[in-house]
Structures are given as C-alpha cells and as structure tokens.
C-alpha cells in the first residue's frame, strides 16, 4: 500500500478469481485512543473499533472511503484505491489503446516544433468518476523540469456503439533548447482514477521523434502563361522554429483528382514552391516534414484547381 | 525517398552536399544495423544514449544561429579552442565562432572515424561474419573532413589485445550509429544555416 | 467456487458463422479480463482473443482478425466469440479463461469445420 | 506459429528427474513472467507454475520453475505415472501483450 496524496492510498492486488488479496491496517489520524468507530463509505454499519482497523482488501467492495468517527464527530478519512497486477503486469482498463504506432499505445503524444512544448491525448469510453493528473519529467534517475497544465476533455466522438472521449494534455520543458541534441528522453506519466480503480500509464520519447509540423500556410496558386502548369507557393507554418535555414523543411507536393482512385502525381521539393500541371477539377495538397529528420509529416493544407 | 525531387542548388558553400550525403549514408547505415540485429537491443528504445564527443567538442554550442543565442537554455556553453582555417571558409569572411564550429564539426568527425575503423576492424574478425560498416559510410566521413580541410593531429587507430566479445560490439555499434545520426542531424542544419547567410 | 462453461459448439460448413458462449459463476465475472484459447486435434494451445473487463479494449490473433469478435455482457455473465467465415483450420476444441496469475479454464467446446 | 520453443518429447523412469527447456527471446520470457501447464487427455489444461517460479497450492513440489534470460524450465522430480501428460510454458511478448504465447508442448511420457 501506498499514498497517492493526503489521505488517498493504492493497495496493489495481484488479480485473479478468489486471490486471497492484501491485509491493510488502517490508523485514524487522531490524538483520541477511545471510542473510535469505523464505516465505509455512505454505510452507517460500523466495521470496526478501535484507533486501527485490520481489514482484508479483495475486490472493489472493500475499497472506498474509511472514517473514523468518536460519538458522531468524523476524526479523519482514509480512501483505498485499487491498482491491479494481472499476471505479473499492470492493468490497463481505463484507457482505450490506439494500437498506433504499435500495439499497447495509450498514450500519444506530438510537437509543432523543437521549442520543448508537447501535447498528449487519450483516449477512454468512461464518461464520469473519471480524474487524471499529469507529471512529466526529462530522464528518469535526475530528472529535469517538465510542466504540464491539467487534463481537459479535448473531443468526444462516436465509434459503433460507445462514445468515445479524448482527453488532452499540453506540456513544457522548463528549460529547452531548440538546438539541442536529446540524449535523455522526456518521460509522461498520467495517474487515472476511475471510481476506486488506480492504474497508471506512461510514455518515453525524444521530442525529435514525436515532430509533426503544422501544414503549411498561404498556399496558392499562379497559373503560367500558355500552359497548363501552375506555380504552387506557400509558406513555412508560423508555428515551426526559427531560423528557418537551420529548422529546414521538405515538402511534397500532390494533385489529386476528384476521384480517389485517380492516380496522384507526387513531387518532393526542399523549396517553397514547386510547378505542377493542374488537371479540371483536381486539387493540389501541400505536406512538410522536417528535412533532416524523418518524423511525421504535417497535414495536408489544400486548394482546389479551379 | 524514391520520388522526384527538385534538389536545390548546390550554393557557394562547398559542405553542404558533403553534409548531405553524410546523413544519408548513416541514415542508411543505421538502418541496415537495426534490421541486421534485430535480435540486439538496437532501436532507439532499447539503446543507451551516448555521445563520444561529449566534453571534447562541444558542436551544438559552437554552432548556434545566431537567433538563438538570446535563448539562455542554448548556451551551456564549454571552453573549448579549436584550429581555425578551414577551406569551407575560402569564399567568405568569416567570424572567429563559424571557424570554431566548423573546427568542432571536423573534430566530432575525426572522433567518428576512428571509433568506426576500431569497430571494423573487430567486426571483420567475427566468425559470424553479421554485419560490416558501410565502406560508402566511412569515405563520405573521410569527403567531408577533407571538404572541411582542417590541420589536426591524426588520432591514432585504437587496437586492442584482448580477443572481442562481438556481442558488445555490436551493439557499442548501434549506440554509436544513433549517436552519430544525430551529429549528422545537428551537422546538416548548420550547413544548411551557413549556406543560407 | 469459479466456473466457466463453455457452449455453442458443433459442425459447420466452410464461410458460415458460429456463436461460443461461455457462462461464468462464482467471481465478479465484470471485474476480469478474459481470454478464448483452441487447440486443434493433436496440436497445441493456440491464443485466439482477449477483452479486458467493459470491452472496450480487445485484441485478437492474427489468424482470427476480421473474421472472429470476442465481446461480453456483465450484465449476463457470459463472454462471447463470434465466428464467421470459418476455415477447416479453425476446427478445435475451444476454450475460454480468466486473465490473471491464477486462471480458470472452462472444459471447452468442439467446434468442426468441414464440408 | 509459437514463439515459445520446447522439446517435442522427454521421458524417464518413476522416480527419476527430468526437465523441459522453454526458449524464447528478449521481448516474451526475457521481459516478461513465465507459467507452466500440465494438460492430460481430453482434459484442460491445469496451472502448474506461475511467476516463474510459484506453485499454486494443490501442485505437488515435485514440480518446480526457473527463469534465465531468454529461457525457461520446469523440473519433475520424482517422476510418478499420473505425470504423462503434454506440458506447455506460456509467457507474453512486450509488443503483443496480452496475447498469450504458448510454447510448442512436450509430451512426457513414463516409462514402465
């Protein structure tokens, strides 16, 4: 057993039908030594007296909230959380796995830029008595500073027959370099308390490795004369970082017909614009990713032909 | 990337291109490593980041645009004097810190040199015969530090006396392969930087 | 004490559907993850799916991807496999089973795929 | 396809020991617990070993796990006839838990 904070504690269970479970001794937080009686949660059945309580945590039942009380005056609360080992590894219900990029994936997270700011999201189709707090760090042993804000219900959708909700999370490296050459991965650990269900869930990455730029801005077109070639500019999104010849894009270039299964001409260029031939009722999409390092690429940023 | 590309001009500076070839080739190299040992601790995930130019060089610092500078995260700054007449400079004056980054960038080259001629040299003694460096690799290295042209010391090739455990270099391999793609990163940015101002 | 029974069992032809059940008693059946295993004739245990406690997360084996749904209703004390498109590979014994250090195996149901 | 490697077959004498190899890699037994099963015929197959080494209670010690590295075993000593039956490890692999990877099964037989 273990505290999560003041007054909330974690007895860890290894899970299975009929396990024989954890005993946990409880102390009221009091100078009195008589008259003490204990219930659990809204019950008014007393389990118990004395200045500790012996109980034996199995199942959810005997979590929840402990009070001690003397002649009706509530001394102090003890909440018991549960955190399940199945098998010899954490259980992982509250969170839905994205299973992108590989199995297991709980958590995402992504950068606009190299300036130490991230975002990371979730997501569960649990809508109430839910809580998740946030702490991040760079390296493990010494870590060094990361502030996150708090989680915020970010989107909610509908998949088959459940909803589905996302939560979000943005963070910043108290102290980060654009230039830098990561050595240390930044680690996320998100605490998520369902009802009296405890599991924790973390994340490890380089922020070079979680780039995604925005798409780039001002695209348009100029048509060249006596052609059907268009020269296609844009620019760097206001969002990447500076300076610009140091934090160099690629780009790639794509006119797409109407039709998805029309064949799509691609071009990759280092530059801010590039010439395309523009079919009738084609569009053409502009994407960038960092140009020495293969991350992800950005979102496609559009305009039509016409 | 196996699409057309518009390559840019190669531009007044002459490393650029070299830097270029540098990240592919390692790029390429890494890549080739992770699937050859693929049952060697050798991803990202798996592997120990180390930098073997860590106190001796210090290319990140010396190499800062200038518009970062004002960013105090930046400038961790080590003293650090480096020789300053490098024949990438030839075509423009240059400041006495571009020389010191470029003497940095040729210094973390050398470094990477010998320890990837070392590794070589016990890999070609392995029975299994696994996995060689790629020789394409070690001349863009060699292209690059010419390009660079800077007057050094040579570094002697380490030998060792006692018999390899090629497991451990294998995977020394792979840590020096991510460290060393992330140098080429860092190498190619300034490169690009330099040969825009 | 825990018990599982599995049910739904028998002979179907190649490309028709079969529905499993397996009926849990004597835990909260809502609070376990579970799994459905099958061995063939003569060959060894092969993991089919799993689903962790309100079925949102599940998980299956390749060789049963888009073909195979493991689902279940607490509510019912039943966990579900719903096969369709079956192969004659997918003739087995089929059992289900409770995650955790020390599980619980039901007796299993055959299932034939023949023509 | 399993993962998990064991022998097809071992045998022995009532009263003898013997033991069943299970070999995996780095991201199954080398990152995760290992159990064993015993499975008579026609029956399902029944928990032997779990965390590696833990018998459940009702599993005579006769029966005992290890774990190193990438691999695993189980020892039978004092081999009894009721002990022929197929016998599998199960571990997890860090990408795919929690698919469960059992091993390819050993028969072990009692010789009279």
């Known amino acids: 057993i273990w505290e999560l904070k003041k007054d909330v504690y974690v007895v860890e269970l290894d899970w299975y039908p009929d396990a024989p479970g954890e005993m946990v001794v409880l102390t009221c937080d009091t100078p009195e030594e008589d008259g003490i009686t204990w219930t659990l949660d809204q019950s008014s059945e007393v389990l118990g007296s004395g200045k500790t309580l012996t109980i034996q945590v199995k199942e959810f039942g005997d979590a929840g909230q402990y009070t001690c009380h003397k002649g009706g005056e509530v001394l102090s609360h003890s909440l018991l959380l549960l955190h399940k080992k199945e098998d010899g590894i954490w259980s992982t219900d509250i969170l839905k796995d994205q299973k992108e990029p590989k199995n297991k994936t709980f958590l995402r997270c992504e950068a606009k830029n190299y300036s130490g700011r991230f975002t990371c999201w979730w997501l569960t189709t649990i809508s109430t008595d839910l809580t998740f707090s946030v702490k991040s760090s760079r390296g493990s042993s010494d870590p060094q500073g990361v502030t996150c804000g708090a989680a915020t219900l970010s989107a909610e959708r509908v998949r088959g027959d459940n909803k589905e909700y996302e939560y979000s999370v943005e963070c910043q490296e108290d102290s980060a370099c654009p230039a830098a050459e990561e050595s240390l991965p930044i680690e996320v650990m998100v605490d998520a308390v369902h009802k009296l269900k405890y599991e924790n869930y973390t994340s490890s990455f380089f922020i070079r490795d979680i780039i995604k730029p925005d798409p780039p801005k001002n695209l348009q077109l100029k048509p060249l004369k006596n052609s059907r070639q268009v020269e296609v500019s844009w620019e760097y999104p206001d969002t990447w970082s500076t300076p610009h010849s140091y934090f160099s894009l690629t780009f790639c270039v794509q006119v797409q017909g109407k039709s998805k299964r029309e064949k799509k001409d691609r071009v990759f260029t280092d530059k801010t614009s590039a010439t395309v031939i523009c079919r009738k009722n084609a569009s053409i999409s502009v994407r960038a990713q960092d140009r020495y390092y293969s991350s992800s690429w950005s979102e496609w940023a559009s305009v039509p032909c016409s | 990337r196996n699409l057309p590309v518009a390559t840019p001009d190669p531009g007044m500076f002459p490393c650029l291109h070299h830097s270029q070839n540098l990240l592919r080739a390692v790029s390429n190299m890494l890549q080739k490593a992770r699937q050859t040992l693929e049952f060697y601790p050798c991803t990202s995930e798996e592997i120990d980041h180390e930098d073997i130019t860590k106190d001796k060089t210090s290319t990140v610092e010396a190499c800062l645009p200038l518009e970062l500078t004002k960013n105090e995260s930046c400038l961790n700054s080590r003293e650090t004097s480096f020789i300053t007449n490098g024949s990438c400079l030839a075509s423009r004056k240059t400041s006495f810190m571009m020389a010191l980054c470029l003497s940095s960038i040729y210094e973390d080259l050398k470094m990477y040199q010998v320890e990837f001629k070392t590794m070589n040299a016990k890999l070609l003694m392995d029975p299994k015969r696994q996995i060689f460096l790629d020789q394409n690799m070690l001349a863009v290295i060699d292209e690059l530090m010419q390009a660079l042209n800077f007057n050094s010391e040579t570094v002697p090739q380490k030998s060792s006396l006692e018999e390899p455990d090629f497991y451990k270099t294998k995977i020394k391999l792979c840590i020096l392969l991510h460290a060393f793609r992330i140098r080429a990163v860092t190498i190619d940015r300034v490169m690009s930087y330099l040969n825009a101002s | 004490q825990v018990q599982l029974v599995e049910s739904g069992g028998g002979v179907v032809q190649p490309g028709r559907s079969l529905r499993l059940s397996c009926a849990a008693s004597?835990?909260?059946?809502?609070?376990?993850?579970m799994h459905w295993v099958r061995q063939a004739p003569g060959k060894g245990l092969e993991w089919v799916a799993f689903?962790?406690?309100?079925?949102?997360?599940?998980y299956y084996a390749d060789s049963v991807k888009g073909r195979f749904t493991i689902s279940r209703d607490n509510s019912k004390n039943t966990l579900y496999l719903q096969m369709n498109s079956l192969r004659a590979e997918d003739t087995a014994v089929y059992y289900c089973?409770?995650?955790?250090?020390?599980?619980?195996w039901g007796q299993g149901t055959m299932v034939t795929v023949s023509s | 396809q399993s993962v998990l490697t064991q022998p097809p077959s071992v045998s022995g004498a009532p009263g003898q020991r013997v033991t069943i190899s299970c070999s995996g890699s780095?991201?199954?037994?080398?990152?995760?617990?290992v159990k064993w099963y015993q499975q008579l015929p026609g029956t399902a197959p029944k928990l032997l070993i779990y965390?590696?080494?833990q018998r459940p209670s009702g599993v005579p010690d006769r029966f005992s796990g290890s774990k190193s590295g990438t691999s695993a075993s189980l020892a039978i000593t004092g081999l009894q006839a009721e002990d022929e039956a197929d016998y599998y490890c199960?571990?997890?692999?860090?990408?795919?838990?929690?698919?469960?990877?059992f091993g390819t099964g050993t028969k072990v037989t009692v010789l009279a």
């Open positions: 089973k409770t995650h955790g250090s020390h599980d619980n």
């Open positions: 004597g835990f909260t059946f809502s609070s376990y993850g």
């Open positions: 689903i962790r406690v309100d079925g949102s997360n599940k």
């Open positions: 780095r991201s199954n037994i080398g990152s995760n617990t």
């Open positions: 965390y590696n080494d």
């Open positions: 199960q571990s997890y692999d860090r990408y795919t838990h929690p698919a469960l990877l």
